[in-house]
Interface confidence: low
């Protein structure tokens, strides 16, 4: 006769582990008992349970309520047992010893592998700012047994590096994703992908990149000179910029306070019916937490009664102040 068993039994944490031990013998052979033991390199061999032909299943009190026979129907030659709710401490080597009559004793050893699925966590790096060099965008850590695989899925150009810490019964893997921040990355997804034999499918955690930047400011509204004539209504100057975080806008007049009736509404400067008093240099101030930028334009309101006067559109000048 011989024992049919497995070299390795793999089970996910919390599941029931079936430890197989089936005696394949001649029809006239009988199994007297099947003894299950835990083989520990430090503690030696520790009885787990005993399947006795006469006494049935008896479990070592230390494993009470955790060891059972598989549900019926059962073959009298099947000495397999179920280890309920496998925990990491159950991982290791097990032995079944089958006492048969008249063939004698047979024994087999197997390894129980308890997979501990990882629960990944993603930690964003320091705030990203356009103009920085290679910077940590995010790190992703996953601990499990065996060691999980941690990779990144993204369209963003960057570099990834991993390091591993081994604990007595598990391993923690941390992967970092570094990049050179640019405004094109803003809003792009950066996904940490964790693979592990204990997972039915990869675990994914997505982080949306936020890169702080502030674009050059420019002013629109002076393109049509005919709008800037005395008496005209609805004239506006609009300050154009973009940034992350979204910028705030402010308007001032370089050569004095804003004329009466001129209204600031966010990025737009609204004029009342135009008079020559509205001529002057206007400055748009754009700022966010990262920096600030200025753009100035010269407005000259044309008086149709005075043909010598023309609307003068001065090229905008730009200034940039980093916070």
């Amino acid at each position: 006769g011989e024992l049919e068993t497995s070299d390795v039994v793999t089970v996910v944490l919390g599941q029931d582990a079936k430890l197989p031990c089936f005696y394949r013998g001649d029809p006239d052979e009988q199994v007297g008992q099947v003894a299950w033991a835990r083989v520990d390199p430090n503690e030696g061999i520790r009885e787990l349970a005993l399947l006795h032909s006469k006494y049935g299943l008896h479990v070592n009190p230390a494993y009470e309520d955790r060891v059972e026979q598989p549900p019926p129907p059962r073959d009298p030659l099947d000495g397999s047992v179920l280890l309920r709710n496998a925990v990491q401490a159950d991982e290791g080597e097990y032995e079944c010893r089958v006492s048969t009559f008249p063939a004698g004793s047979f024994q087999a050893r197997m390894r129980l592998r308890v997979l501990v699925p990882p629960l990944p966590s993603l930690n964003p790096g320091p705030p990203l700012e356009e103009g920085q060099g290679l910077t940590l965008a995010a790190s992703c850590t996953a601990e499990g047994s065996p060691a999980p695989s941690v990779t990144w899925d993204t369209e963003v150009k960057g570099t990834q590096s991993s390091r591993s810490f081994t604990h007595p019964r598990s391993a923690a893997v941390t992967s970092e994703f570094h990049l050179v921040p640019s405004r094109s990355m803003n809003g792009q997804p950066l996904t940490c992908v964790v693979s592990h034999p204990g997972l039915l499918q990869d675990r994914r955690i997505t982080h949306t990149l936020q890169v702080a930047f502030l674009a050059e400011a420019s002013v629109r509204g002076l393109e049509d000179q005919n709008l800037w004539q005395v008496g005209r209504e609805g004239a506006t100057l609009k300050c154009l910029s973009e940034g992350q975080p979204p910028p705030k806008y402010n308007w001032t007049r370089l050569d004095g306070p804003l004329p009466s009736g001129v209204r600031v509404k966010g990025d737009t400067l609204g004029f009342p019916p135009l008079t020559t008093e509205h001529s002057g240099v206007y400055v748009c101030h754009v700022s966010n937490e990262l920096s600030s930028r200025d753009s100035q334009v010269t407005v000259e309101v044309l008086d149709p009664e005075d043909p010598g006067k023309q609307v003068d559109l001065v090229s905008a000048s730009h200034h940039h102040h980093h916070h």
Epitope: R46, L50, H52, Y55, S99
Partner: antibody, heavy 119, light 107 residues
């Protein structure tokens, strides 16, 4: 048929030594947990010591710890009890018994061997 | 160590009587309790194991019950061959321990 036969008993002086043997037959000795149990004249049963199939797990009653040593030789199907520093209170019939494990009942017993400690 | 306390230590009964012997463990031993019968000059014989399971060949008038710390051996109708000493034994942990015994005598 399962048989357990003890031998080695006899009269010994206090402080003396004896070695008991238990020869097993009719079952796979090497798979079974073996125990020594004693019974003083007119008294109850007292478990003395036990040893697992591979000698990996050994236990003793407090009353004999440090004086008695249990061992087995699976190749000879024999269980032993080395008794040193014997005292008058060790006088008893010594039985060997087998069980599937220490947490199973003692289902087969030998006929016993009498140890008398007296000056 | 687990102490096993058996009571009574002796009792007198007549053939046909119902006899009950109790055994108390000093801590919870689940159902790891066995009962043995010993006749004078004879080897102990296993009657009941796992608190309530009858050993093969043992008459059905013997029964066992209990779990945890309190256990009972009952002989429903005492027969002449049942006059003997009865011992309980815990197999929950080593050292294995026996009760002091209950001697059942003829009234």
């Amino acid at each position: 048929e399962v048989q357990l036969v003890e031998s080695g008993g006899g009269l010994v002086q206090p402080g003396g030594s004896l070695r008991l043997s238990c020869a097993a037959s009719g079952f796979t000795f090497s798979d079974y947990y073996m125990s020594w149990i004693r019974q003083a004249p007119g008294k109850g049963l007292e478990w003395v010591s036990g040893i697992s199939w591979n000698s990996g797990s050994i236990g003793y009653a407090d009353s004999v710890k440090g004086r008695f040593t249990i061992s087995r030789d699976n190749s000879k199907n024999t269980l032993y009890l080395q008794m040193n520093s014997l005292r008058a209170e060790d006088t008893a019939v010594y039985y060997c018994a087998s069980s599937g494990s220490w947490y199973l009942p003692l289902d087969y017993w030998g006929q016993g061997t009498l140890v008398t400690v007296s000056s | 160590d687990i102490q096993m306390t058996q009571s009574p230590s002796s009792l007198s009964a007549s053939v046909g009587d119902r006899v009950t012997i109790t055994c108390q463990a000093s801590q919870d031993i689940s159902n790891y309790l066995n009962w043995y019968q010993q006749k004078p000059g004879k080897v102990p014989k296993l009657l009941i194991y796992a608190a309530s399971t009858l050993q093969s060949g043992v008459p059905s008038r013997f029964s066992g019950s209990g779990s945890g710390t309190d256990f009972t051996l009952t002989i429903s109708s005492l027969q002449p061959e049942d006059f003997a000493t009865y011992y309980c034994q815990q197999s929950y942990s080593t050292p294995l321990t026996f009760g002091g015994g209950t001697k059942v005598e003829i009234k």
